[in-house]
Interface confidence: medium
């Protein structure tokens, strides 16, 4: 049978800057925690992402807010804790 | 009022190994096709992303299927013209 | 499991606007469009139109482009359609529903919210 | 916009009999890219639809094997062997080739 082929519309629907789930290392939001390891070691968290059709603009966030999430922190030696840590989402992207 | 917080549960669900929407550039799955422009620039795919709770352990594709997707491809002095490119989705993603 | 949630049934004055909510839960949000179906007696269904969430992206049928504003929030995972200028034949049941796009193979909805009454009346 | 035709409007039927509707559309369903998106969804009173059938004659999760699509180009049929009485409603069939994605006017299967 043919391919099915997705259209210019839906890929350029889907392409353009947008909030999009990524997961990011929690180590790589809190930086000062490098010698603690966390569970789970990354978090999913709405970034902007995409491209803008122009290579002189950028997707970027022009709203954001905070997430708060509930994570194991594990310290060599000592019994894991359950700690809340606050991450920035992004609510709102637009190329600029 | 009180912060809202993600429990442990759904933080370690959401992070978890699995196939997640990432734009990705069409040039970097097309390399040889780096003098040409594409519009759009990036197409949205299926990669495993994640993490496994274990750091000797990685996220990977152990399932994988093509998807053939309508582009503009503009050359220099050239009309565009509509290209079918194919790319590869990730399906099923493991720890291993 | 995915599950679409709306807002409770609105009774509202001509000329007034209203704005319907949708929230979603259950899979990655923006990743799958949203759309908004009309459905009255006599009519049967009605597509208005469809956002994909966090973008800019969203069709409409042209019979309700100026109608109907789709609008969506990725940080609470809700979509939201407002219809204007509100007379008597905007009065009907409003779904919003998940469709895959033809990006995962053809663009029908394959989950919807339990509907929203919308009654127009002076 | 397509227009999207049901026949019968209603349809009475006894509990393990066959039932059996079609939907014809105004242009033809296949798309560009060779695919026919053509769907149908079920309406049970006070509910909203729920997606049985998807490009022809794919059944969505949970659909019973008794309910089957068939069909092509202009035409199309759904069929329900063994009708039981969890299956009365409204059947509506749905067209996403062309823009705006337009639906048939519905057939009410009622039980004897």
């Known amino acids: 049978s043919e391919v099915e082929v997705v259209p210019f519309q839906e890929v350029w629907g889907r392409s353009y800057c947008r909030a999009l789930e990524r997961l990011v290392d929690v180590v790589s939001e809190y930086p000062s925690e490098v010698e603690h390891m966390f569970s789970p070691s990354c978090v999913s968290l709405l970034r902007c992402t995409g491209c803008c059709g122009d290579e002189n603009l950028h997707c970027v966030p022009v709203e954001t807010a905070n997430v708060t999430m509930q994570l194991l922190k594990i310290r060599s030696g000592d019994r894991p804790s359950y700690v809340e840590l606050t991450f920035s989402q992004h609510v709102r992207c637009e190329c600029r | 009022s009180e912060v809202e917080v993600v429990p442990f549960q759904e933080v370690w669900g959401r992070s978890y190994c699995r196939a997640l929407e990432r734009l990705v550039d069409v040039v970097s799955e097309y390399p040889s096709e780096v003098e040409h422009m594409f519009s759009p620039s990036c197409v949205s795919l299926l990669r495993c992303t994640g993490c496994c709770g274990d750091e000797n352990l990685h996220c990977v594709p152990v399932e994988t299927a093509n998807v053939t997707m309508q582009l503009l491809k503009i050359r220099s002095g050239d009309r565009p013209s509509y290209v079918e490119l194919t790319f590869s989705q990730h399906v099923r993603c493991e720890c291993r | 499991q995915v599950h679409l949630q709306q807002s409770g049934a609105e009774l509202m004055k001509p000329g007034a606007s209203v704005k319907i909510s949708c929230k979603a839960t259950g899979y990655t949000f923006s990743s799958y469009w949203i759309e908004w179906v009309k459905q009255r007696p006599g009519h049967g269904l009605e597509w208005i139109g469809e956002?994909?969430?966090?973008?800019?992206?969203?069709n409409f049928n042209e019979k309700f482009k100026d109608k109907a504003t789709l609008t969506a929030d990725p940080s609470s995972n809700t979509a939201y359609i407002q219809v204007s200028s509100l007379t008597s034949e905007d009065s009907a049941v409003y779904y919003c529903?998940?469709?895959?796009?033809?990006?995962?193979?053809?663009?029908?909805?394959?989950?919807w919210g339990q509907g929203t009454t919308l009654a127009v009346s002076s | 916009d397509v227009v999207m035709t049901q026949t019968p409007l209603s349809l009475p039927v006894s509990p393990g009999d066959q039932a059996s509707i079609s939907c014809r559309s105004s242009q033809s369903l296949v798309h560009s890219n060779g695919h026919t998106y053509l769907h149908w969804y079920l309406q049970k009173p006070g509910q909203s639809p729920k997606l049985l059938i998807y490009k022809v004659s794919n059944r969505f999760s949970g659909v019973p094997d008794r309910v089957s699509g068939s069909g092509s180009g202009t035409d199309f049929t759904l069929k329900i062997s063994r009708v039981e009485a969890e299956d009365l409603g409204v059947y509506f069939c749905s067209q996403s080739t062309h823009v705006p994605p337009t639906f048939g006017g519905g057939t009410k299967l009622e039980i004897k």
């Open positions: 529903a998940r469709s895959t796009g033809f990006y995962y193979g053809g663009n029908y909805f394959d989950h």
């Open positions: 956002i994909l969430p966090g973008s800019v992206s969203n």
